[in-house]
């Protein structure tokens, strides 16, 4: 049913869900300084536009009672729930932040006719993609899925110098929910991935994974997982890995790899870590230092949701037009917006594009370094470091399957 | 053109008090972190407390921790450092400079425009 939206006459305000089962474990508190700090920041700029109006934010917290499992897994009806809540109270603000879980985001879409914008530091997964009211501030997985179909098929880079056409995907249930959107796009048989390869099995035992390191008879050199350096650890340890295999690791939202101090473990010479490009964020800092590196962008999308509403805002009142208006919720998307770090780039369907970063082990430094960056504006790889210390033989890549000729 | 000018140094006992204003003129205010720095005679010029765009998250140097605050106030376009329980070795040059983006920051080479300085000395 419609609400009537807390969206006119010089006073704006935002809806924020605080939902107990989120996609990061992240500290409330945490995100209410987010979203305070943005709130101010908003506040300035339309002060600075001449705009004298009002903009607020409203938290809506769940009972936790029934659904508290702390994760995504019963996040689906929490979000009906909240928004139930915001329908009894009437109290819609004129845009949504939150929810962040893939479920909920997909089920609030599809059961409310929604013609407020939905902002979401989340919703990885596929089924949110394409929809024309909701924003994604982290990256989805169709980024990812686009960057490795990229990845695979570059054949002419001094280190790449082989078409890819199979992998190995390792995914035992027990990831993150980012990981578990990303790798669950790579396993969908009707995924852009699986169409574009010719070969793909998922590992979902410890075992099937331990054993292809060392499998001559493997179909393929190359395996996608998802997680940090730790996670690999405790899977791989200190065994042996054929020379020709190569681990992507997908850990976009973990900064550790740029800090000046760090040094890759001897289990990583074999591992291609697939990031995102720490860009401006300031390393050194007390809005990151006290969080997770993941965290971090989780609170950080918060912030963003919030500048980039003021951004809309301010847009639509300097032109004099109406903010409860469909043409208002369809305007999140295909734009640029000063965030919190610096420019913030939305494609054509509200989703944040970002410079992937593809790292590799230097075997004379033991340090982490930029191979390659990755565009998901355009859709384009940049070769960053043409030789290569790598591990592989003569610094190159291997083909991804064993015994095979130049392609 | 982006203009800080800071105020509100001046000679003080050790134990004395000291509240510098820096006031900005010509840009946007709000969007930015704002930071304070200092320098000694004969020393670099290091951090000394820090603030973000919305001023929810402050920062500041071991040295100073406990002692100095940092505020802003959008409407007068005015960050404040609150310098309690001042000690000699506080002697400085006192900069407020404005960072590149909204995020807090204590890395000197983030920030873009710096005020002229006021001079703080503590007497023993």
């Known amino acids: 049913s419609q609400v009537s939206q807390n969206c006119h006459n010089g006073s704006y305000e935002i809806s924020v869900l605080m939902m107990g089962n989120s996609a990061f474990a992240e500290p409330l508190k945490n995100l209410e300084d987010a979203v305070n700090e943005g709130l101010e920041i908003v506040r300035g700029r339309l002060q600075n536009a001449g705009l004298n109006v009002t903009v607020n934010a409203t938290f809506m917290y769940s009972d936790g009672l029934i659904h508290n499992s702390g994760d995504c897994r019963s996040s689906t009806c929490e979000g009906l729930d909240l928004l139930r809540k915001i329908s009894n109270a009437q109290r819609m603000g004129c845009v949504l932040i939150g929810p962040s879980c893939t479920y909920s985001t997909f089920q609030m879409y599809l059961d409310t006719e929604l013609s407020y914008p939905m902002i979401s530091a989340g919703s990885f997964g596929l089924s949110c993609d394409y929809k024309e009211t909701l924003t994604r501030l982290m990256s989805p997985a169709r980024k990812l899925m686009y960057f490795l179909v990229n990845f695979w098929k570059t054949n002419d880079l001094p280190f790449k110098t082989y078409s890819w056409s199979t992998s190995y995907v390792y995914k035992n249930g027990t990831e993150t929910e980012d990981c578990f959107w990303y790798l669950n796009a790579l396993e969908a048989s009707v995924s852009y991935f699986s169409h574009e390869l010719g070969f793909k099995v998922v590992l979902r035992q410890d075992k099937e994974f331990q054993d292809i390191l060392m499998d001559h008879n493997r179909k393929s050199n190359v395996i996608i997982m998802c997680g940090g350096p730790e996670f690999l650890y405790k899977l791989k340890g200190d065994r042996a890995v054929a020379e020709d295999i190569v681990i992507i690791l997908v850990d976009l939202f973990n900064d550790q790899y740029f800090e000046d101090n760090v040094t890759a473990p001897d289990y990583m010479k074999n591992v291609l870590v697939l990031t995102l490009s720490p860009g401006n964020s300031l390393l050194n800092s007390s809005f990151s230092r006290n969080l997770s590196p993941t965290k971090r962008d989780f609170a950080l999308a918060y912030l963003n949701g919030i500048l980039l509403f003021g951004h809309m805002l301010k847009i639509f009142l300097e032109n004099g037009e109406n903010i409860t208006t469909p043409k208002f919720a369809h305007a999140f998307r295909n734009l640029t917006f000063e965030g919190y770090d610096g420019p913030v780039t939305l494609d054509d369907w509200g989703d944040v594009d970002s410079t992937m970063v593809l790292l590799y082990t230097s075997v004379d430094t033991k340090k982490y370094k930029v191979l390659l960056t990755y565009d998901t504006h355009v859709n384009k790889t940049y070769p960053v470091d043409m030789s290569p210390t790598f591990t592989w033989k003569n610094s190159k890549l291997p083909n991804d399957i064993t015994g095979r000729g130049p392609q | 053109q982006v203009q800080f000018v800071e105020s509100g140094g001046g000679l003080v006992q050790a134990g004395g008090s000291l509240r510098l204003s820096c006031t900005a003129s010509?840009?946007?205010?709000?969007?930015?972190?704002m930071g304070w720095f200092r320098q000694a005679p004969g020393k670099e010029r290091e951090f000394v407390a820090a603030?973000?765009?919305?001023?929810?998250?402050?920062d500041f140097a071991d040295s100073v921790k406990g002692r100095f605050t940092i505020s802003r106030d959008r409407a007068k376009n005015t960050v404040y450092l609150q310098m309690n329980s001042l000690k000699p070795e506080d002697t400085a040059v006192y900069y407020c400079?404005?960072?590149?983006?909204?995020?807090?920051?204590?890395?000197?080479?983030?920030?873009?425009?710096w005020g002229q300085g006021t001079q703080v000395t503590v007497s023993s």
């Open positions: 400079a404005r960072a590149r983006t909204a995020r807090l920051t204590s890395r000197r080479h983030d920030y873009d425009y």
């Open positions: 603030i973000s765009g919305g001023g929810v998250y402050t």
């Open positions: 010509g840009g946007i205010f709000s969007n930015y972190g």
